[in-house]
């Protein structure tokens, strides 16, 4: 049974926010076995995702189609939210990552039960998939801590390219690290609200 | 093909009860919030009670809060809305309603009715 | 409780534009679904978050959100369009339904 967990920490912006709280309270899902074989995350995180430009994005999920809407929310309308997942990468991404002992921090992405966010690097696109784990490695994103209590999200699959948002729409954005580390259109944040 | 079928309702007394249930199938039943709307002879619908898929919780309608009782067991894709001390103003037709979407993490009734059953009519009279 | 007025009727004749009102407080602030019930017939949903129609639902059913009034618009309404009409929104994880609207189809 899920329950509405109370977290200390407003934003999942730093690596503090994670470990920084004696009281890391596990999310009951690790409890009950829906961590990776032989991988166990570090933590697990509700919170809901919005763009630089304070855009909620939101998941109409059904067993056979979805959308991921990008927008502005009705004042009524709860967020919705995203179970994040932490783990330890063992491998290093294309820029330092923000980890602990030159380990990367990686996130897996689930709106509801069985479903996560995969990167689909031949279409550019972010789907979602309904999977059993252990997870393929299209669900694993690098978590990078940008400026303005922002993160970014980089493929496992593919270095150089992060979840992004085009023509209101989430899809994968390759990054020119020289030019556009802190482009907006690939920055988010992660609140507890 | 999501299908959703009522049963349960009957001809009861004053102050009697009826368990309604309603199968589902074609879908991931445990993945999305359900409801009980019902809709009285000629008049118009009315939501009666919802059940979060997420963690279960509970939500009923003002005027049958504390007599009726919305259960759902997912290991037999069926939805239930026990009904005691009925009152002649429960008299009508009660349907099944599946929420459009999976439920989000988040949690409650929030997304619009997707998909409907036929009903069943629930008759309080003495 | 959250009260959503509809008008009880409506007629429009055949290919004319009918217009159906769904007024609440604050109702664009909400997101408002429409349903159609045909005699003997379930409800179908026909319009969602406002505006988006699900997939069967003839294109002539659009719908708009704004200000305190939603309103479902049946363009090149068709003698199978006559039915009753009502829209709905989430209150506070309830639901609430309008009282309705025969569509007549003259």
């Known amino acids: 049974m899920h329950h509405h967990h109370h977290h200390h920490h407003h934003h999942a912006a730093g690596l503090n926010d994670i470990f920084e709280a004696q009281k890391i309270e596990w999310h009951e899902a690790a409890i009950e076995g829906r961590s990776i074989t032989g991988i166990s995350p570090i933590t697990e995180y509700l919170a809901s995702l919005s763009t630089y430009n304070d855009q909620s994005i939101t998941f109409a999920l059904e067993d056979e189609s979805y959308e991921i809407y990008v927008e502005d929310l009705k004042k009524d309308k709860k967020k919705d939210k995203v179970l994040l997942s932490y783990y330890e990468s063992q491998h290093p991404s294309s820029e330092s990552g923000d980890g602990v002992d030159g380990k990367m921090l990686m996130v897996t992405l689930s709106p509801t039960k069985d479903f996560w966010l995969q990167a689909n690097n031949k279409e550019h696109s972010v789907e979602l998939h309904k999977c059993e784990k252990p997870l393929p490695d299209q669900a694993f994103f690098v978590l990078h801590n940008r400026s303005f209590n922002c993160v970014s999200f980089e493929c496992k699959t593919d270095p150089g390219v992060f979840i992004g948002v085009k023509d209101n729409h989430l899809a994968l954005i390759k990054v020119d690290y020289s030019e556009n580390l802190g482009s907006e259109n690939i920055l988010f944040k992660l609140s507890e609200i | 093909e999501v299908q959703l079928l009522e049963s349960g309702g009957g001809l009861v007394q004053p102050g009697g009860s009826l368990r309604l249930s309603c199968a589902a199938s074609?879908?991931?039943?445990?993945?999305?919030?359900m409801s009980w709307v019902r809709q009285a002879p000629g008049k118009g619908l009315e939501w009666v009670s919802g059940?979060?898929?997420?963690?279960?919780?509970?939500y009923y309608a003002d005027s049958v809060k504390g007599r009726f009782t919305i259960s759902r067991d997912n290991s037999k894709n069926t939805l239930y809305l026990q009904m005691n001390s009925l009152r002649a103003e429960d008299t009508a037709v009660y349907y099944c309603?599946?929420?459009?979407?999976?439920?989000?993490?988040?949690?409650?009734?929030?997304?619009?009715?997707?998909?409907w059953g036929q009903g069943t009519m629930v008759t309080v009279s003495s | 409780s959250y009260v959503l007025t509809q008008p009880p009727s409506v007629s429009v004749s055949p290919g004319q534009t009918a217009s159906i009102t769904c007024s609440g407080e604050?109702?664009?602030?909400?997101?408002a679904a429409w349903y159609q019930q045909k005699p003997g017939q379930s409800p179908v949903l026909v319009i969602y978050?406002?505006?988006k129609r699900p997939s069967g639902i003839p294109e002539r059913f659009s719908g708009s959100n704004s200000g305190n009034t939603a309103t479902l618009t049946i363009s090149g309404t068709q003698a199978m369009d006559e039915a009753d009409y009502y829209c709905?929104?989430?209150?506070?994880?309830?639901?609430?339904f309008g009282g309705g609207t025969k569509v007549t189809v003259l």
């Open positions: 309603a599946r929420d459009l979407w999976m439920e989000n993490w988040v949690g409650g009734l929030r997304y619009p009715f997707g998909y």
């Open positions: 059940i979060s898929a997420i963690d279960q919780s509970t």
């Open positions: 978050r406002d505006t």
């Open positions: 604050r109702m664009g602030d909400k997101y």
């Open positions: 709905e929104v989430k209150k506070s994880d309830t639901g609430v």
């Open positions: 074609g879908f991931t039943f445990s993945s999305y919030a």
